[in-house]
Structure formats: structure tokens, C-alpha cells
Amino acid sequence: HTAAQDNCTCPTNKMTVCSPDGPGGRCQCRALGSGMAVDCSTLTSKCLLLKARMSAPKNARTLVRPSEHALVDNDGLYDPDCDPEGRFKARQCNQTSVCWCVNSVGVRRTDKGDLSLRCDELVRTHHILIDLRHRPTAGAFNHSDLDAELRRLFRERYRLHPKFVAAVHYEQPTIQIELRQNTSQKAAGDVDIGDAAYYFERDIKGESLFQGRGGLDLRVRGEPLQVERTLIYYLDEIPPKFSMKRLTA
């Protein structure tokens, strides 16, 4: 049963439809696009969020900024297949029967193929590097203040256990946040680093997924931290399988 608020909205996912159609007339919330019941006490999986986003009006779609780096999300938005628990299915295909394998954050990790392509397992992304460039400020931020504020943000806003924020690096104007979470470390109930990173990415872009909360107002010792560029790198537990043509391009 979804743990939604009494006024029948989903605090952690605005891309839902909620109604008091549950047991005893209690509130239930379902993700747009998939119609899947979501747990409103925690982050919704990235797969269900992408599916919901693709069901929104076309003018609401924006492509992810391309990059030359491997396992940066070059492919932009697509309408993913999610499993019964909201995770990405290992193999994704489009309407023209072009298929590819993805990792646990839904990023392509193989060359594209046809329907005969096999993706034996969903490979876990265990290390995410979020690379930010902030707008110019009067002076550099204090590194330890910045570190503490970003850790607090991931703990309080995204409910990510502090042990999964491995490091915060800072060389003005570049900030790097490292998230690490092996399969063996992730306990029942732990927020997935991929979901936290996706919520953070949408917050940074001014597209908050939270219901009724204001946008992200990041401040370090009262000084606004305004991000002007974001790149996210994904490292998988098993290296990706791309042809040499792509790697040398």
C-alpha cells in the first residue's frame, strides 16, 4: 500500500495520479504512463519516472545534453520497459525493433542491435560521478562547508544513506559528488544511488519531481550555489560492451 499523505497526493512524486480507492478508502498513488502503484514515502524509481515523463505532453520533453564520454547518458529520453518492481529491464527496445542493453540507471551499455540481442542480467551501476560547474561567485566556497551541505542534501531531500556519498571534491568552479553503492551494500529500504542522482539532476535543472515543494535552493553558508553545467558519469560493476568503432570515435 502506498504511504501517501492524508490529502491524497504523493509528496515524493508529482508525476502520479492519486485517489482514495485503496482499502478502507485510503489514498493510492499510481505513476503516470505505467499506472504502477508507487511508494510515496521514498523516491520513485528512475524507470517509472522516465516512463511518466514520456507520457507527458511532447513539449515537456528535453533531451539530456550529449557528451563524448563513455556511459554518459548520450541517448536522451526514451520510453523504457520497467519490471514489476519499477526497475529497468535489462533489454530495452524501441518501436522499430532496435534493441540495446542498459544498466540499473537505464543508460545504454552496449551497441544497438535487433530483437535477437540478449541482455542476460541487469548490470548494476555501483559508482556515479556527478560533475557540476557552479556560476562565478565572489570567492570560492569553503570546501568543508560545501561538502557538509551536499551530504545533508542527499540525506534529507533524497533520503540517501550518508555512507553512499563517498566523496565531495571541489576545485573552483568544479564540484564532483561521488556516489558508491555495491549490490552487497544495498539493504532493503535503501534508496538507490541511481534514483537519488536522477532526482538531483532534475532538481538542478529546475524540474523538481517533489510535490508542492519549492525548487532546490542550494546555499552554502547563506551563499547561493547556482549550477550552470551538469555531467553525470556512470560506472557499472561489469564494464560496458561497445564496439571499437564507438570507443575510438
Partner: antibody, heavy 123, light 112 residues
């Protein structure tokens, strides 16, 4: 795997109170409502009430409203039921049980049960 | 409160039999959104009750396909094909459409 651990038995005196515990593991505690169910010796099952561990919201069977108080401790993933002003009528086995899965549609059904705590009210 | 009536109270069987248990409610268990929260449980001596069916007819994981459910509104049926020794015990239906949620009185499945 999902587990709901309850102590085996409690012996309490008439007029006193008892606080029964139910420790959950193997799933996201705050994502599923918890029910409490009573079974008197040789009798059927009775629904006492439910609690949403995410926000502490409760719904009670009117019959137990002045008798039972449901609470949770999120930090330890434990649900509690306090039973007050105990009489011999309260001697029973009390089960905590989790409401069904978010994804498979088994809402309103009790998919996992604790082993039950046998409460004996006797002087 | 919604009264849930189960029949029969006792059901003597032989192994291999096919049986049906009836569950009737004093008002419709289908809410205004079309959802019916009716589930069935088996309670064996010395164990906790276990979920068999939810949403009238959906088998819970690990429940054999000899258990099936049907019905709508106020009338529901649990059918067990080819009774086995492990099927003996008390069967309860449970409605969670209306507060307070209520159980049927139970049906004891026992050997003849």
C-alpha cells in the same frame, strides 16, 4: 526475505497494560501499512487496527479504540501495540501482519504475518 | 460494520475431494472505483495464518493452482481441487473495502 518478529508470550496482571512489539526486516518498513489481529482461544480472527509507518496515521476498529494504541519506531523498523486496562477477555494471541505488496496489487491483503504473541491476563 | 458470513462452519473431506467454501457480506465489497478487497487465508494449528488469494481470485506467490477464487459484490467462493493433507485447517475470508475490516467466522476443513 520479509520477517515480522514477535515475542512468544506475555503474562500480565488484570488492570495493567502491555506493549507488544513487532520487528520488521527484509523490506522498506515505511512503505507498507501494518495491521494487528486478535485471536481468542478457540475463536476466529478479529481486526484491531492499522498503522502507516511512514507518518504514524492509524485507523482502529471502534471496538478496540479505547483499548489499543498503535505506534511505530521507524529507526528500528518496529511496530508496537499497547493494550490497556487488561481483563481476561484480552487473553489472546495477537498477530502483527503486513498489508500487501506495492507492485503486485495485493493491497488490503495480509501477505506476511508474525508468529503471534500469546497474552495471558491472570492475577 | 460489514458482517461477513462463511459457510459451512465445518467441512469434512477425503483426500482428493473438491470443495467450495462460501463467503457472503452484508454489503457490497466493491468500492466506487471498482476495487474489491476480498482475500482468503488458511490457518493451520500452531502456525500463523497464511495468505492464499487476494482481490477475489489472485493467487499469492507459492500458492498451488488447486486454489481458486470467484465472486463479486456480496457473494464469494473459494474452491479447492484435489484436497491434500497440507490443506487441512481453518479457512477465513477477509474484507478490507470498508472500515473496520472484518473476517468471516471461519470454515474448518477436516478429514472425514
Amino acid at each position: 526475505q520479509v520477517q515480522l518478529q514477535q515475542p512468544g508470550a506475555e503474562l500480565v496482571k488484570p488492570g495493567s497494560s502491555v506493549k507488544l512489539s513487532c520487528k520488521a526486516s527484509g523490506y522498506t518498513f515505511t512503505s507498507y501499512w501494518m495491521y494487528w489481529v486478535k485471536q481468542r482461544p478457540g475463536q476466529g480472527l478479529e481486526w484491531i487496527g492499522e498503522i502507516n509507518p511512514s507518518n504514524g496515521r492509524t485507523n482502529y476498529n471502534e471496538k478496540f479504540k479505547s483499548k489499543a494504541t498503535l505506534t511505530v519506531d521507524k529507526s528500528s523498523s518496529t511496530a508496537y501495540m499497547q493494550f490497556s486496562s487488561l481483563t481476561s477477555e484480552d487473553s489472546a494471541v495477537y498477530y502483527c501482519t503486513r498489508e500487501g505488496h506495492n507492485y503486485d496489487g495485493s493491497l488490503g491483503a495480509m501477505d506476511h504475518w508474525g508468529q503471534g504473541t500469546s497474552v495471558t491476563v491472570s492475577s | 460494520d460489514v458482517v461477513v458470513t462463511q459457510t459451512p462452519l465445518s467441512l469434512p473431506v477425503s483426500f482428493g475431494d473438491q470443495v467450495s467454501i462460501s463467503c457472503r457480506s452484508s454489503q457490497s465489497l466493491t468500492n466506487s472505483y471498482g476495487n474489491t478487497f476480498l482475500s482468503w487465508y488458511l490457518h493451520k494449528p500452531g502456525q500463523s495464518p497464511q495468505l492464499l488469494l487476494y482481490g477475489i481470485s489472485n493467487r499469492f506467490s507459492g500458492v498451488p493452482d488447486r486454489f481458486s477464487g470467484s465472486g463479486s459484490g456480496t457473494d464469494f467462493t473459494l474452491k479447492i481441487n484435489t484436497i491434500k493433507p497440507e490443506d487441512l485447517g481453518m479457512y477465513y475470508c477477509f474484507q478490507s473495502t470498508h472500515q473496520p475490516y472484518t473476517f468471516g467466522g471461519g470454515t474448518k476443513l477436516e478429514i472425514k
